[in-house]
């Protein structure tokens, strides 16, 4: 007789997870070298001993801690992207701007990202039919936790100028119940981070709006000058443009604005 | 069985450009980096580049940058090396490589090589 | 980058003799240097990986030691097999680099 399972409301955990993980923590320390003192098989037991055979509602930021010291990492603390609903552009950028570093360019972040993970109570199984939603179920599950935790001591690393790219096509630019806006914002340092400078990104071709008047900015603005951080804010109205500039600065296209 | 094969020879002219292939089969390509390396007729081994299949991300020796573009396809498990601009210098074969799981950060696994001529 | 000197650039060995090839890199790289054999018209071979690890299947004639910027890579008995050409590398800082290759012979 089939053992019940609970049912979640979100996907379950991604196919082939344990060796994607694996996978990838060897990717990172062949591209990474730096990183090379790392043992992958150990990243892993790591990783799966914050979530196995733990209720899927019930995970803490101490329950990542093996898996977070393991993946001690120093990025240049003045370096840091942070993003917020645009993702896939930062991602573009630093792979362009190789001096720059999302949470993503991480090895933490590389391993996780866009996987969904999640075990049950008192089994060592992984469940691959259903996870718990954020929304619908609870906000302490296995996915949720690690990115708060991992965002956290990003955010808390960062110093001097931190830049954060926004997309200027939603109805919220800045988000508070974002990673950026519920976590990021209120981990930066004060005492080391000087300026938090906004990007927001255009989508539209034609528009030209200054998005930096845009009342959600403006409560980050407000959010950011409270805690003793400055505040700066441009539009990129051509992403494309942009882009193809930090490629080709010299290029003669690129002293207009982008 | 893990295998890496590659397109045929190549003939160009200088000015050209020259697009490699490097289909792989025995395992998850996504799960390994793919590197490109350079040999000329008779001479050593130069490391080109690499790429993540599964991001595309890429990274080119200071040599190689703005000549060569690495790519690769996800739904054909192929990585593609680009030279562009070629000149008689190019002559050379050009494998795909990469690690393993027992073999610290040396490259167990290679193409059979493709030879591209480069010659007016 | 990182320069991986290789000497000799050839030598020629009686069958059964020790051969031993050294490679020298112009910074430490710790124990990430590689070893490979090419013969000719064939893709290199994985022999050593780590300095001194032999790669599955390799002969325990092929051996190789050193680690910081000294390295050594031994073939124990020479065999009519091993006429090939063999190049040490260095993984450990990007861009990875070839030595210059040392050609074997039989006398």
């Known amino acids: 007789v089939p053992r019940w399972r609970q049912q979640w409301s979100g996907p379950g955990t991604t196919k082939r997870f344990p060796e994607t993980v694996l996978a990838r923590c060897v990717k990172y320390t062949e591209i990474h070298p730096e990183m090379r003192h790392v043992d992958c098989q150990s990243v892993w037991d790591a990783f799966k001993g914050a979530f196995i055979s733990k209720h899927p509602c019930n995970i803490t930021e101490e329950d990542y801690q093996p898996l977070m010291k393991l993946g001690t990492q120093t990025v240049p603390c003045n370096k840091i992207l942070l993003w917020s609903r645009i993702k896939d552009l930062a991602h573009q950028f630093t792979q362009v701007q190789r001096d720059m570093f999302t949470l993503e360019d991480t090895l933490l972040g590389y391993l996780a990202d866009d996987l969904t993970w999640c075990g049950e109570f008192n089994t060592s199984k992984i469940n691959y039919q259903s996870c718990p939603d954020w929304r619908k179920d609870c906000s302490n599950n296995p996915v949720s936790v690690f990115w708060k935790t991992v965002s956290r001591r990003f955010a808390e690393a960062a110093c001097d100028v931190v830049h954060v790219m926004l997309n200027g096509s939603r109805s919220k630019i800045f988000d508070k119940n974002s990673t950026f806006g519920s976590v990021e914002v209120h981990n930066l340092q004060p005492e080391k981070v000087q300026t938090l400078e906004a990007w927001v990104i255009h989508g539209g071709r034609e528009d030209s709006r200054d998005l930096c008047q845009d009342p959600t900015i403006k409560e980050l603005e407000s959010i950011i000058s409270k805690r003793n951080i400055q505040f700066s804010c441009k539009n990129i109205y051509r992403p494309d443009k942009f882009l193809q500039c930090v490629k080709n600065p010299e290029d003669s296209s690129c002293t207009s604005e982008i | 069985e893990v295998q890496l094969v590659q397109s045929g020879a190549e003939v160009k002219k200088p000015g050209a450009t020259v697009k490699i292939s490097c289909k792989v089969s025995g395992y998850t390509f996504t799960d390994s980096v793919m590197n490109w390396v350079q040999q000329h007729p008779g001479k050593g081994l130069e490391w080109m580049g690499w790429i993540d299949p599964e991001y595309g991300r890429t990274d080119v020796a200071e040599k190689f940058q703005g000549r060569v573009t690495i790519t690769a396809d996800t739904s054909t498990d192929t990585a593609y090396m680009e030279l562009s601009s070629l000149r008689s210098e190019d002559t050379a074969v050009y494998y795909c490589?990469?690690?393993?799981?027992?073999?610290?950060?040396?490259?167990?696994?290679w193409g059979q090589g493709t030879t591209v001529t480069v010659s007016s | 980058d990182i320069q991986m000197t290789q000497s000799p650039s050839s030598l020629s060995a009686s069958v059964g003799d020790r051969v031993t090839i050294t490679c020298q890199a112009s910074q430490n790289v710790d124990s990430d240097v590689d070893w490979y054999q090419q013969k000719p018209g064939k893709a290199p071979k994985l022999l050593i990986y780590k300095a001194s690890q032999r790669y599955t299947g390799v002969p325990s004639r092929f051996s190789g030691s050193g680690s910081g910027t000294d390295f050594t890579f031994t073939i124990s008995s020479l065999q009519p097999e091993d006429i090939a050409t063999y190049y040490c590398?260095?993984?450990?800082?990007?861009?990875?680099?070839f030595g210059g290759g040392t050609k074997v012979e039989i006398k």
């Open positions: 590398a260095q993984s450990n800082t990007h861009p990875r680099t």
């Open positions: 490589a990469r690690t393993g799981y027992n073999s610290g950060y040396g490259f167990p696994y």
